[in-house]
């Protein structure tokens, strides 16, 4: 099959939509339910949470609540809003206006054009504060999720049916089956469909064999397929990469943990932004990459590939895509380089007959017997060799 | 009782734009939330754009964003819909609707709907 279109929503940069980038997540939460998966739905405005608006809640924003929340869909017995408002009757005419009271015009409302979370947007002051919340309960014995990837969007596809998760046999499993994995999880359109042992076999039961997405369905299950647990095994899991994963190389350094920071998103190879290309991101890199912490951060070179990638981190995550991460659609990196890194594992940092001094670090003997790079006043740091 | 009455549509070309008003007879028109729904022949009503009481929220859907606009002027008891890059599927019958309860992007919550007018997108 040919791989599927890039959905176009895709091809949005945050700044220039109402709607949800794949890097963000749906501001939402469930609260007083019997899971995570269940109770009130609240929304995130700036630094507080408040309860979704009962009377604009409909299963189109239930069916997108579930899935951002990784719940599966929504079950029909989600408590929605009645077919006739429950609500305060309209003032008599002649009464005074009463908008001006922020207790009357204060619930926000989450409200979806589609059942897909970056579909939705939380609209301010929709419904006035008349104490009817949205509720809903998930499918939460539904789900699925890719494991072993490095990432949310990478990895064994495994499903949870019956309480229980399990993989997928790779009978069949192409583009279009891994395209829909991919959308289900908010995640993209399929980069690649992967047979078995390209990740870590699972351990427990395999849920389904033969499937035959269309690639249009909206959840794996409902695919054609066969039930799993006869001529399959665990070298059989498929997986899948989507266009959301991110993974990242170095390039042009002496190793893999020097050189120019390339992150591999949608499809294609991009130089990030070193404008915001901070000691953070830069550790974080390192470590992630399994070389060691960051020594410095060289000046960049003009973008040899398209650069549209931003991150900020805060120096703890283990990955970047665990940071707050912005991709520029429209836009190259305006008036930056694209960032580089030299990693403390770089055997350029290790190797003392290599004449070259990397930018920005001075060599100093102490005693004859010790060598001493000082890195750069931004980090400030000593490393004994 | 409030009234809603609809006026500014008519016949225009592909591209072109038109101007929507909807008045109320209602004093406490500012205790409404607004609307926009429309019905093109054989097919059912559909939300267009929606504003809040006081204005400061807006919502449109998918097919009308960035080419319509949902403005009200409380002090002239008026809503607004400015259609601009207009097309053929625009073509329907407009109704301006207001909600006491909550913003009128669900039918449910509608507590009154105009009349309506005709916006027809031709060359």
């Known amino acids: 099959h040919p791989s599927p279109a890039p959905p176009d929503q895709l091809n949005t940069s945050s700044a220039e939509s109402e709607l949800w980038e794949p890097g963000e997540r749906l501001p939402v939460r469930l609260t007083n339910g019997s899971s995570s998966c269940s109770g009130t739905v609240e929304v995130r405005l700036e630094a507080s949470w408040e309860p979704a608006c009962g009377a604009l809640w409909d299963s189109r924003a239930a069916e997108a609540v579930c899935r951002a929340l990784g719940c599966g869909g929504a079950e029909a017995a989600s408590q929605l809003a009645p077919p006739t408002p429950e609500l305060p009757p309209p003032p008599a005419a002649g009464n005074t206006s009463v908008a001006a009271n922020a207790t009357l015009a204060g619930a926000p409302a989450l409200l979806c054009s589609g059942a897909e979370w970056r579909l939705c947007e939380v609209v301010e002051h929709a419904c006035r504060s008349d104490g009817r919340r949205a509720r809903v309960t998930c499918a939460e014995n539904r789900a699925l999720r890719l494991v072993d990837g490095g990432g949310a969007c990478a990895g064994r596809v495994e499903m949870l049916e019956h309480g229980e998760w399990g993989s997928v046999c790779d009978d069949t499993w192409d583009l279009e089956d891994a395209h829909v994995v991919c959308r289900q999880l908010g995640c993209g359109w399929a980069v690649q469909a992967l047979p078995g042992l390209h990740f870590t076999p699972g351990r427990g039961p395999i849920h389904r064999d033969q499937v035959n997405c269309s690639g249009a369905e909206a959840y794996l299950w409902d695919c054609p397929g066969l039930p799993g647990q006869h001529y399959c095994g665990h070298k059989e899991d498929a997986g899948a990469v989507c266009s959301e994963h991110q993974s990242w190389r170095l390039t042009g350094g002496a190793d893999r943990c020097e050189g120019q920071v390339e992150v591999h998103f949608r499809g294609v190879w991009n130089t990030v932004c070193d404008s915001e290309w901070y000691p953070s991101e830069a550790k974080v890199l390192c470590q992630s990459l399994g070389c060691g912490t960051a020594v410095e951060r060289p000046k960049g070179l003009p973008h040899s590939l398209s650069g549209r990638m931003y991150y900020s981190c805060n120096g703890e995550e283990l990955t970047l895509s665990n940071c707050s991460w912005r991709f520029n659609n429209s836009n190259l990196c305006s008036q930056s380089l694209a960032a580089r890194v030299l990693c403390s594992a770089s055997r350029s940092l290790h190797n003392l007959s290599t004449p070259e001094v990397p930018a920005s670090v001075q060599t100093v003997t102490i005693e004859s017997s010790v060598t001493v790079k000082i890195e750069n006043k931004e980090s400030r740091e000593l490393m004994l060799l | 009782q409030v009234q809603l009455v609809e006026s500014g549509g008519g016949l225009v070309q592909p591209g072109g734009s038109l101007r929507l008003s909807c008045s109320a007879s209602?004093?406490?028109?500012?205790?409404?939330?607004l609307g926009w729904f429309r019905q093109a022949p054989g097919k059912e009503r559909e939300f267009v754009a929606a504003?809040?009481?006081?204005?400061?929220?807006?919502y449109y859907a998918d097919s009308v964003k960035g080419r319509f606009t949902i403005s009200r002027d409380n002090s002239k008891n008026t809503l607004y819909l400015q259609m601009n890059s207009l097309r053929a599927e625009d073509t329907a019958v407009y109704y301006c609707?207001?909600?006491?309860?909550?913003?009128?992007?669900?039918?449910?919550?509608?507590?009154?709907w105009g009349k309506g007018t005709q916006v027809t997108v031709s060359s």
């Open positions: 209602e004093r406490t028109f500012s205790d409404y939330a």
């Open positions: 609707v207001a909600s006491w309860g909550a913003m009128p992007v669900l039918t449910h919550v509608i507590n009154y």
């Open positions: 504003i809040n009481w006081v204005g400061g929220s807006t």
